[in-house]
């Protein structure tokens, strides 16, 4: 499977809420011997590999924000911790998963990465990620609502480990 990022750039006014989205593409195993971790973190555009650095989102690590479940089950973070920081990550039955950030500030601007790790009972692991940019703007040039820009390429870096 791969991860698609429907939008590569989100431009939002300060104070607005935004939902960043990734989508799982391709066949997804729903067996009992597989589980999926889906999570979010901030990163930087590395010279070698985007999304290799995993920085917190509003002081919450990718471990704080992770969802895990089998197959296409829906899941979402009910963590009080995440909600106290104005964050919620969610996943549906159709391979979409997202993070919602409330009351955006200029400090929220940056590169965001979604990570999916498919872990099999018998020790193989498939990791894929997607990246998108969030720009939070203030002042007279800021849009009144979030404006999203579609990705030109929806491919993701991925690795299978056995």
């Amino acid at each position: 499977f791969k991860v698609a990022t429907p939008y590569s750039l989100y431009v939002c006014p300060e104070g607005q809420n935004v939902t960043l989205t990734c989508r799982l593409l391709g066949p997804v195993d729903k067996g009992h011997d597989v589980t999926f971790y889906k999570t979010w973190y901030r990163s930087s555009r590395g010279e070698v590999q985007t999304c290799s650095e995993r920085r917190p989102i509003r002081n919450l690590t990718f471990q704080d924000l992770h969802l895990h479940h089998g197959g296409h089950q829906a899941a979402n973070t009910s963590h009080d911790l995440a909600q106290r920081h104005g964050l919620e990550s969610a996943s549906d039955h159709h391979g979409n998963f997202s993070i919602t950030m409330r009351n955006l500030t200029l400090l929220d601007s940056g590169l965001y990465c979604c990570l999916v790790v498919e872990i099999r009972h018998h020790h193989s692991e498939h990791r894929v990620h997607g990246a998108m940019e969030l720009q939070v703007q203030t002042g007279k040039d800021a849009p009144s609502n979030c404006v999203v820009y579609p990705s030109s390429s929806q491919d993701s870096e991925n690795i299978t480990a056995a």
């Epitope: 590395g46 590999q49 650095e53 895990h68 790790v117 872990i119 009972h121 193989s124 692991e125 690795i159």
Partner: antibody, heavy 120, light 107 residues
């Protein structure tokens, strides 16, 4: 803050077995793989195997296959490593360590180590 | 299995020196390379993950670089507390494998 606390030092006879425990606190236990890594005196680090508690089944290095058993008890957030048919070369410090995610990503938290001495 | 080869196996350096340790993988591991520091009688401590990302709480004098098969750990200005043994480890696939270690000693 995540903490991994291991059981105390052991002295064993050749041919016997040893079981080392690793109790996790301060984080979600079930979701993260725990690996066991050993270090013989003056030597480097050697991965023995690991377990993801939600799966229950373990992943072993070929060298230890058949001689090591790694288990986890979700109710007590404790992982165990049992090594059988001990020989003098198994004298080492045994560490448990937690992966940040999945089977193979980096080991971010380590136990304090358990010295196992095999001697007749 | 993926073999990890570190060099040098030991080095002597003075406080303030720039120190470089290299690690080579027997096959491409993308950026899935981690560096650990170990002091005598203590457990290893994660310094760098994903080849170049600094683990939280680790001083910025430590840096990592590389991709594919060749990787480097650099300590820009060696401090007294940095005298230790350093290990690389691949996190590309199981079985996990470590380099044999590089001992950094006081000159």
């Amino acid at each position: 803050q995540v903490q991994l606390v291991q059981s105390g030092a052991e002295v064993k006879k050749p041919g016997s077995s040893v079981k080392v425990s690793c109790k996790a606190s301060g984080g979600t236990f079930s979701s993260y793989a725990i690996s066991w890594v050993r270090q013989a005196p003056g030597q480097g680090l050697e991965w023995m195997g690991g377990i993801i508690p939600i799966f229950g089944t373990a992943n072993y290095a070929q060298k230890f296959q058949g001689r090591v058993t790694i288990t986890a008890d979700e109710s007590t957030s404790t992982a165990y490593m049992e090594l059988s048919s001990l020989r003098s070369e198994d004298t080492a410090v045994y560490y448990c360590a937690r992966h940040v995610l999945g089977w193979v990503l980096e080991l971010d938290y380590w136990g304090q180590g358990t010295l196992v001495t095999v001697s007749s | 299995d993926i073999q990890m080869t570190q060099s040098p196996s030991s080095l002597s350096a003075s406080v303030g020196d720039r120190v470089t340790i290299t690690c080579r993988a027997s096959q491409s591991i993308s950026s899935y390379l981690n560096w650990y520091q170990q002091k005598p009688g203590k457990a290893p401590k994660l310094l760098i993950y994903a080849a170049s990302s600094l683990q939280s709480g680790v001083p910025s004098r430590f840096s990592g670089s590389g991709s594919g098969t060749d990787f480097t750990l650099t300590i820009s200005s060696l401090q007294p507390e940095d005298f230790a043994t350093y290990y690389c480890q691949q996190s590309y696939s199981t079985p996990l494998t470590f380099g044999q270690g590089t001992k950094v000693e006081i000159k």
